[in-house]
């Protein structure tokens, strides 16, 4: 642990004559620096140099060639490595006064004229005289304000808001300071911090905007942490809103975003007067270019029952926002001519849900449906086939005679989706055909009976059964069935000999 540096002259304060020169020496066990009034300035009349000596100590000399009122203030010698932005400098101090009969008060930076007080805390109105002997009074609109005065610091007290002026008289001449504006700040023991990012997904070249708002608190220090921080890419802004309540809105803007700007954006608010901290973060992603992803919640072949109500839902992830449209058999779906509707709803920032709704499914609703999502950078589509399932029904059941051969063909035409299966049944005892047990299924391998099925179109099927010879009257039943239902019809086949007898009669 190093002992504090030492200063020559070894005094707390020193009064230096106007326009004279003075020098301060600092000795330390390590490298030392000076902090002094106007040290932000490249001041031509303050010179700092290192001095060699044989004591083994580091020596730094501060020299002022022509002292002026502006040189009045605290001079601090400190070890280089101990300086931190947060803390007050630790080191050895000397206060220098340079009395000037024409300049009663040390010129201040303009921000010093804004005195911030928190709640009922005490504050300092920092009017400092160039001469420690100068009497000073403090005034506001009500007159002289009682407060304790220290020429090194100013007036210390509890002040109400408004303008305050320090007044001094030097050799019969009156001086006043620029008005100090005492401003009361609201500070709460807890930090109410809200973060907002209207967008978390961007593409290259766009501007990222993130805001953090602090409510009911004016004594706040807010820091941003974000991927482009090292490069200083962000522009920060502060807006103060007073109505209906105090709100500090901090905005971080990152123009011309690139993929490298993807990551966590964090704001950390710290109560400037208390150790209260609060942080919020949001993850931002920047894509090289826009994108679209389509996720259907159904397969590429879908069936719907006749008159059924059915919804087909497609999830879409896209940025920038997509235009979504539906096609049927490659033609734009005209909704008002059908009982089909479509809609799109935004679920999240880049998530959308589109629905195709069949209100009462009809046969003609069958077909190929395509959803198309597109933005300026991408186009994606998804096509599925829809079949309207119709219960099977028999359109026609007819017989056909083969003339002299005595053979007969029965034709059964049925429709339905899916295409119905056709089964044939036969009842040989015409008197007992009312009894189900009298009916037997025609097997395909029976000699002299041929069954065949032909598909006429997508939803119509024709079944044929050919009897080589019909020798007695029989009943034939056609049974058409699919997943949704079955229908049957019966036909009587009369033997040709019987038919001719009937004709003669």
């Amino acid at each position: 642990q190093l002992s504090l540096p030492s200063i020559l002259p070894n005094e707390n304060e020193k009064v230096v004559q106007l326009n004279s020169s003075f020098s301060l020496r600092c000795f330390g066990e390590s490298e030392v620096s000076w902090q002094y009034p106007m040290s932000e300035e490249e001041s031509s009349d303050v010179e700092i140099r290192n001095e060699e000596n044989n004591s083994g100590l580091f020596v730094t000399v501060l020299e002022v060639s022509s002292a002026s009122a502006a040189h009045t203030g605290l001079y601090t010698c400190y070890y280089n490595h101990t300086q931190t932005e947060e803390n007050e400098l630790e080191g050895r101090h000397i206060y220098i006064y340079v009395p000037d009969p024409d300049v009663a008060f040390v010129p201040l930076g303009m921000t010093d004229y804004l005195v911030i007080v928190e709640d009922d805390d005490s504050a300092i109105i920092p009017c400092r005289t160039t001469d420690p002997e100068t009497p000073v009074t403090l005034h506001n609109s009500e007159g002289v304000v009682p407060a304790s005065y220290d020429s090194r610091q100013g007036f210390n007290g509890t002040f109400t808001v408004g303008p305050y002026i320090c007044e001094a008289t030097v050799k019969g001449k009156k001086f006043q300071t620029i008005p100090f504006n005492v401003y009361a700040l609201k500070a709460t023991s807890e930090l109410d911090l809200e973060m907002e990012a209207l967008k978390t997904v961007y593409k290259s070249g766009e501007t990222i905007v993130v805001t953090c708002a602090v409510f009911n608190n004016e004594v706040v220090d807010l820091q941003w942490t974000y991927p482009g921080e090292v490069k200083g890419k962000g522009i920060t802004m502060l807006e103060e809103i007073k109505v209906p309540s105090i709100k500090l809105v901090y905005t971080l803007t990152v123009p011309e975003a690139t993929v490298k700007d993807s990551g966590d954006y964090e704001c950390a608010a710290r109560q400037a007067t208390r150790e209260v901290k609060e942080m919020k973060k949001v993850t931002i992603s920047v894509h090289e270019k826009g994108f679209i992803e389509i996720k259907p919640t159904f397969s590429q072949l879908e069936a719907v029952n006749l008159h059924e109500v059915k919804h087909f839902v497609v999830e879409v992830r896209a940025y920038p926002p997509p235009r979504i449209s539906w096609l049927k058999n490659n033609l734009t779906l005209i909704e008002n001519l059908t009982e089909i509707t479509t809609d799109v709803e935004k679920i999240q920032e880049i998530r959308y849900r589109s629905k195709l709704k069949l209100i009462r499914a009809k046969e003609e609703d069958s077909g190929h449906y395509t959803i198309v999502a597109q933005n300026e950078d991408a186009v994606k589509s998804y096509t599925f086939e829809l079949l309207t399932q119709v219960p099977s029904s028999i359109l026609d059941l007819v017989d056909d005679h083969h003339g002299s051969t005595g053979g007969q063909t029965v034709r059964c035409t049925a429709e339905g989706t899916p295409l119905p299966d056709i089964e044939w049944m036969i009842c040989k005892d015409i008197k007992k055909c009312n009894n189900e047990t009298s009916w037997t299924i025609l097997a395909n391998n029976v000699s002299n009976i041929i069954t065949e099925i032909h598909s006429r179109d997508r939803s119509t099927v024709e079944g044929r059964v050919t009897f080589a010879k019909v020798e007695e009257t029989i009943a034939v039943r056609c049974l058409a069935k699919n997943l949704l239902g079955a229908e049957n019809r019966e036909l009587k086949l009369v033997a040709p000999t019987l038919r001719s007898e009937l004709t003669v009669a």
């Epitope: 106007m38 001041s43 002026s68 502006a70 024409d102 930076g109 005034h139 303008p163 006043q176 008005p179």
Partner: antibody, heavy 117, light 107 residues
Framework: QVQLVQSGAEVKKPGASVKVSCKAS????????MYWVRQAPGQGLEWMGI????????SYAQKFQGRVTMTRDTSTSTVYMELSSLRSEDTAVYYC??????????WGQGTLVTVSS | DIQMTQSPSSLSASVGDRVTITCRAS??????LNWYQQKPGKAPKLLVY???SLQSGVPSRFSGSGSGTDFTLTISSLQPEDFATYYC?????????FGGGTKVEIK
């Protein structure tokens, strides 16, 4: 003796900027504030702002905020006042004035700025 | 902002007259009121500061008084060189503001 010498008259077009200089001598430049005051033809005086030459900090009247910039060069003991986006109503005599208090014991001779298309 | 109102806006007087110009502030400004004299084509000149202090080199016929909101500049015996325009200025609060001026003319 204290002297404030300002730059010469200027004629500017609307939308342009003007930069007026004020060179101080005869006193310690960094010990006194410099103020800028303007006076339109036949009108009264209007305070524009202040600069502390020691450090360069400034405070501007709300009316000029965003349009006025006050700077200084300590090596030449000169302060500058730049007014941008000029309009015809900015036609005025612009004065720099010194003061350790917010009243002005020494004034420059004034610089007439005429804004005309 | 504090508004400063001067009256009269102009007056005619003769050499040797006692002349009084008043200045009223829109709110209390304690005694932080200053007076300037301006002659045509010239820069203003500080006469009186903090209500009643006479700037060095200013003749003693000029005096200032008042506090709160009402202030007065008095010229006890008007001289030929005093025909000019006089302005008051408050230094109590930022922005610093001036009165509209009082023109003193020869009768």
């Amino acid at each position: 003796q204290v002297q404030l010498v300002q730059s010469g008259a200027e004629v500017k077009k609307p939308g342009a900027s003007v930069k007026v200089s004020c060179k101080a001598s005869g006193y310690t430049f960094t010990s006194y504030y410099m103020y800028w005051v303007r006076q339109a033809p036949g009108q009264g005086l209007e305070w524009m702002g202040i600069i502390n030459p020691s450090g360069g900090s400034t405070s501007y009247a709300q009316k000029f905020q965003g349009r006025v910039t006050m700077t200084r060069d300590t090596s030449t003991s000169t302060v500058y006042m730049e007014l941008s986006s000029l309009r015809s109503e900015d036609t005025a005599v612009y004065y720099c004035a010194r003061g350790s208090s917010p009243f002005f014991d020494y004034w420059g001779q004034g610089t007439l700025v005429t804004v005309s298309s | 902002d504090i508004q400063m109102t001067q009256s009269p806006s102009s007056l005619s007087a003769s050499v040797g007259d006692r002349v009084t110009i008043t200045c009223r502030a829109s709110q209390i400004i304690s005694h932080f009121l200053n007076w300037y004299q301006q002659k045509p084509g010239k820069a203003p000149k500080l006469l009186v500061y903090v209500a009643s202090s006479l700037q060095s080199g200013v003749p003693s016929r000029f005096s200032g008084s008042g506090s709160g909101t009402d202030f007065t500049l008095t010229i006890s015996s008007l001289q030929p060189e005093d025909f000019a325009t006089y302005y008051c200025q408050q230094s109590f609060s930022i922005p610093l503001t001036f009165g509209g001026g009082t023109k003193v003319e020869i009768k």
